[in-house]
């Protein structure tokens, strides 16, 4: 007769026997019998299985292809896959990080709101009034306009989102 309930956690039912699943890092060689427990074997080099399982083949570790801008962030074990990330200056194109693209630069008139990481691109924001950015950069924030008054100077040319103000000496001839 079948067991009154399903087999326990970490077990599977086959041929009226509750067999133990193979533990993470091991693959199934043969199902259990009444007299022998499930036969399991450790995954080979560069292979893994990350759950209790009845898989007959282990999965290959992910390859971090340097030609796609990838490098190893965390080496895989028999129980975990390799985690890839991107080379400096690049970020993943997807959550799975299968390829990389160059970090976006923020154009003049825009500053960096959030610097890119290995998994996210640069976030740019327009420079608000009183701030400017005159370079294309993946790191530079918007800079505040120079305060001419604190230097005892006057504004000779107004600033824009791309240019700083130009300060000059006060006109001494004015009464």
């Amino acid at each position: 007769p079948e067991p009154p309930t399903a087999c326990r956690e970490k077990q599977y039912l086959i041929n009226s026997q509750c067999c133990s699943l193979c533990q993470p890092g091991q693959k199934l060689v043969s199902d259990c019998t009444e007299f022998t427990e499930t036969e399991c074997l450790p995954c080979g080099e560069s292979e893994f299985l990350d759950t209790w399982n009845r898989e007959t083949h282990c999965h290959q570790h992910k390859y971090c292809d340097p030609n796609l801008g990838l490098r190893v962030q965390q080496k895989g074990t028999s129980e975990t896959d390799t985690i890839c990330t991107c080379e400096e200056g690049w970020h993943c194109t997807s959550e799975a990080c299968e390829s990389c693209v160059l970090h976006r630069s923020c154009s003049p008139g825009f500053g960096v709101k959030q610097i890119a990481t290995g998994v996210s691109d640069t976030i740019c924001e327009p420079c608000p009034v009183g701030f400017f950015s005159n370079v294309s950069s993946a790191f530079e924030k918007c800079h505040p306009w120079t305060s001419c008054e604190t230097k005892d100077l006057v504004v000779q040319q107004a600033g824009t989102n791309k240019t700083d103000v130009v300060c000059g000496p006060q006109d001494r001839l004015r009464a």
Epitope: P1, P3, P4, T5, C7, R8, K10, Q11, S16, Q17, C18, S20, C22, Q23, Q26, E34, F35, T36, E37, T38, E39, C40, L41
Partner: antibody
Framework: EVQLVESGGGLVQPGRSLRLSCAAS????????MHWVRQAPGKGLEWVSG????????HYADSVKGRFTISRDNAKNSLYLQMNSLRAEDTAVYYC????????????????WGRGTLVTVSS | DIQMTQSPSSVSASVGDRVTITCRAS??????LAWYQQKPGKAPKLLIY???YLESGVPSRFSGSGSGTDFTLTISSLQPEDFATYYC?????????FGGGTKVEIK
């Protein structure tokens, strides 16, 4: 409370019989295989017998085969060990033990044990 | 039957010590090995199953490792309540068999 309580042990003469009982509570008794494990005074542990949830898989250690009989009554949440033709070498504390699986009495490990009952075989 | 050989048979240690007990199977048993703790006059208590998985409620200072024929139980920092006898047991094939035990004593 999840527990196993053995009873029925005592002093018995060689060649005589004894019946051990194990009362289970706090878990669904008929979901699990059950076993008897013994321990001679000052010695290690020895598996004696096991029975599947449905009593269709019953197995014994060679040392007790033909003399001991394991059985269970799921309606009473009870496990039994009938011991006949007892010998001095059967002297031990007998533990009732629960198996985390259900389907075989031939192998397993033991995630819950009773406190044991002492069987002394001596003339 | 599969023979289980434990070593050492006894070990003297102090509170805070790291203690390692080994168990060797006479045949390959995959990872089907359990470890038990037994205190005098008490029933054995399951510590570890499938060679390395901690039973619910067991302190994390206990750990198990190994696969195939060679297995280890480690107590990372011995506590006063850990002085006891430890047994390994294979459940790979019929009949289940135990190691001879390792007594952990106070130095």
């Amino acid at each position: 409370e999840v527990q196993l309580v053995e009873s029925g042990g005592g002093l018995v003469q060689p060649g005589r019989s004894l019946r051990l009982s194990c009362a289970a509570s706090g878990f669904t008794f008929d979901d699990y295989a059950m076993h008897w494990v013994r321990q001679a005074p000052g010695k290690g542990l020895e598996w004696v017998s096991g029975i599947s949830w449905s009593s269709d898989s019953i197995h014994y250690a060679d040392s007790v085969k033909g003399r001991f009989t394991i059985s269970r009554d799921n309606a009473k949440n009870s496990l039994y060990l009938q011991m006949n033709s007892l010998r001095a070498e059967d002297t031990a504390v007998y533990y009732c033990a629960k198996d985390p699986t259900a389907t075989t009495g031939a192998r397993g490990y033991f995630d819950l044990w009773g406190r044991g009952t002492l069987v002394t075989v001596s003339s | 039957d599969i023979q289980m050989t434990q070593s050492p048979s006894s070990v003297s240690a102090s509170v805070g010590d790291r203690v390692t007990i080994t168990c060797r199977a006479s045949k390959v048993i995959s990872s089907w090995l359990a470890w038990y703790q037994q205190k005098p006059g008490k029933a054995p208590k399951l510590l570890i199953y499938a060679a390395s998985y901690l039973e619910s409620g067991v302190p994390s200072r206990f750990s198990g490792s190994g696969s195939g024929t060679d297995f280890t139980l480690t107590i990372s920092s011995l506590q006063p309540e850990d002085f006891a006898t430890y047994y390994c047991q294979q459940h790979s094939s019929f009949p289940p068999t135990f190691g001879g035990g390792t007594k952990v004593e106070i130095k």
